[in-house]
């Protein structure tokens, strides 16, 4: 997260760290007791490493009573996701067992009504992604509030030049932005999961290259079918 600040510890109990061989790779969001939603491209970066999900964490390194690392029973990328595009960049991870719920571990309600968030709405994005252009990684969860950007502006030639489909949404990126390592994490508007950080190799913090988020409401049928 660029231009953000440290989050209040455990105030986002849905927040997950998707890890490979014990290292944070991507963000994720607990959407059901045994399921974490993330970004499909995160799996590509995992190669053949052991994928696990950390829940109940604020610090990645320090011991915390609520922290627990779960093995992944099943990884289900969206069937239409492709390495060369950010379309359908969603991944569902089934945990080896149901998460132990509590004040620091709780699923987040996700948007099912397929309607765009009003431009200008302030939404919260959180993650353990880099906090500087130099690539510094934080130990503790960071967050930032970002205004939603209308799709027409996001589709301008100097922005994303028509690449933003109806299944995506954008948020402003003027110095405050999600960045590398935040992919798969939640964009939360009014206490509801609206978007998932896409995992393209986008420049961060440049206002002409807004953050791109996969709209979960557009994938309600797929999410329901996998969770069923």
């Amino acid at each position: 997260i660029l231009g953000g600040r440290e989050a209040e510890a455990h105030a986002r109990p849905y927040m997950a760290s998707v890890q490979v061989n014990g290292e944070h790779l991507c963000g994720g969001v607990l959407v059901a007791e045994q399921w974490v939603l993330s970004a499909a491209h995160c799996l590509e970066d995992a190669a053949d490493g052991k994928v696990q999900v950390l829940l109940g964490a604020h610090s990645l390194s320090q011991p915390e009573p609520s922290k627990r690392l779960y093995d992944v029973l099943r990884a289900v990328p969206h069937p239409d996701s492709r390495p060369d595009t950010i379309d359908h960049d969603l991944l569902l991870l089934q945990l080896s067992e149901k998460a132990t719920l509590g004040p620091a571990v709780r699923p987040l309600p996700w948007q099912r009504v397929d309607r765009d968030v009003e431009p200008g709405t302030l939404c919260d994005v959180a993650g353990w992604g880099i906090v500087s252009h130099a690539g510094r990684r934080p130990d503790r969860l960071q967050h930032v509030l970002l205004p939603v950007l209308d799709r027409a502006t996001c589709n301008r030639r100097t922005h994303h030049d028509g690449a933003i489909t109806q299944r995506m949404m954008c948020a402003e990126s003027n110095r405050r932005d999600s960045c590398k390592g935040d992919s798969g994490g939640p964009l939360v508007c009014g206490g509801v999961l609206e978007g998932v950080v896409t995992s393209g190799s986008r420049v961060c913090g440049n206002r002409k290259k807004p953050g791109i988020y996969t709209r979960v409401a557009s994938y309600a049928a797929w999410i329901d079918s996998v969770l069923a």
């Epitope: 209308d150 027409a152 030639r157 100097t158 690449a163």
Partner: antibody, heavy 116, light 112 residues
Framework: EVQLQQSGPELVKPGASVKISCKAS????????KNWMRQRHGESLEWIGD????????SYNQKFRGKATLTVDKSSSTAFMELRSLTSEDSAVYYC?????????WGQGTLVTVSA | DVLMTQTPLSLPVSLGDQASISCRSN???????????LEWYLQKPGQSPNLLIY???NRFSGVPDRFSGSGSGTDFTLRISRVEAEDLGVYYC?????????FGGGTKLEIK
């Protein structure tokens, strides 16, 4: 299939105004800016301005400020350009184009002829 | 405004020949975001312009690979490796990096 259908040719008298339209189909109208260009006979293209169909925000080429006014009607997925105080210099083909990707989609053009 | 100057004005070619069109801007058209929004359009007689190349060298979908774009800064070139009859028309370069966006004066590709 993305289509931009422009209104038909106009023959107008000097000093009058004209309003030409550009109806979009095959995509969600509010997802892309609409741009307008002018092309006088045998000449190159000039950018007039653009409009965000979500909120009506406009940007104009200084050269066309006071000459062109851009508007949209979201309910009919139509963009409009009004040209006022017309002179023979305004006789041209006027194009609308969707921005994104680039100007990949153009209307067929509307010929405006200013003549007494 | 950024002035885009195309040369030549007219380019007579034989079918199967290579054709090159030059486009120069009077200032750099690198955008503040680092990208260069230089595009090429072909306008056939009585038709609207068609996008060929965007961001200097990227072919738009459906554009044959005989079309290629190159250049940087202020100096850009469109090349057609083997001219076909359907390629005839007026070619325009365009810069979208600075407001107002501007087009070149056009180059007419015609049969020799």
């Amino acid at each position: 299939e993305v289509q931009l259908q422009q209104s038909g040719p106009e023959l107008v008298k000097p000093g009058a105004s004209v309003k030409i339209s550009c109806k979009a189909s095959g995509y969600t109208f509010t997802d892309y800016y609409k741009n307008w260009m002018r092309q006088r006979h045998g000449e190159s293209l000039e950018w007039i301005g653009d409009i965000n169909p979500n909120n009506g925000d406009t940007s104009y080429n200084q050269k066309f400020r006071g000459k062109a006014t851009l508007t949209v009607d979201k309910s009919s997925s139509t963009a409009f350009m009004e040209l006022r105080s017309l002179t023979s210099e305004d006789s041209a083909v006027y194009y609308c184009a969707r921005e994104g990707p680039s100007f990949a989609y153009w209307g067929q053009g509307t010929l405006v002829t200013v003549s007494a | 405004d950024v002035l885009m100057t195309q040369t030549p004005l007219s380019l007579p070619v034989s079918l199967g020949d290579q054709a090159s069109i030059s486009c120069r801007s009077n200032q750099t058209i690198v955008h503040s975001n680092g990208d260069t929004y230089l595009e090429w359009y072909l306008q056939k007689p009585g038709q609207s312009p068609n996008l060929l190349i965007y961001k200097v060298s990227n072919r738009f979908s459906g554009v044959p690979d005989r079309f290629s774009g190159s250049g940087s800064g202020t100096d850009f070139t469109l090349r057609i490796s083997r001219v076909e009859a359907e390629d005839l028309g007026v070619y325009y370069c365009f810069q979208g990096s600075h407001v107002p966006p501007t087009f070149g004066g056009g180059t007419k590709l015609e049969i020799k």
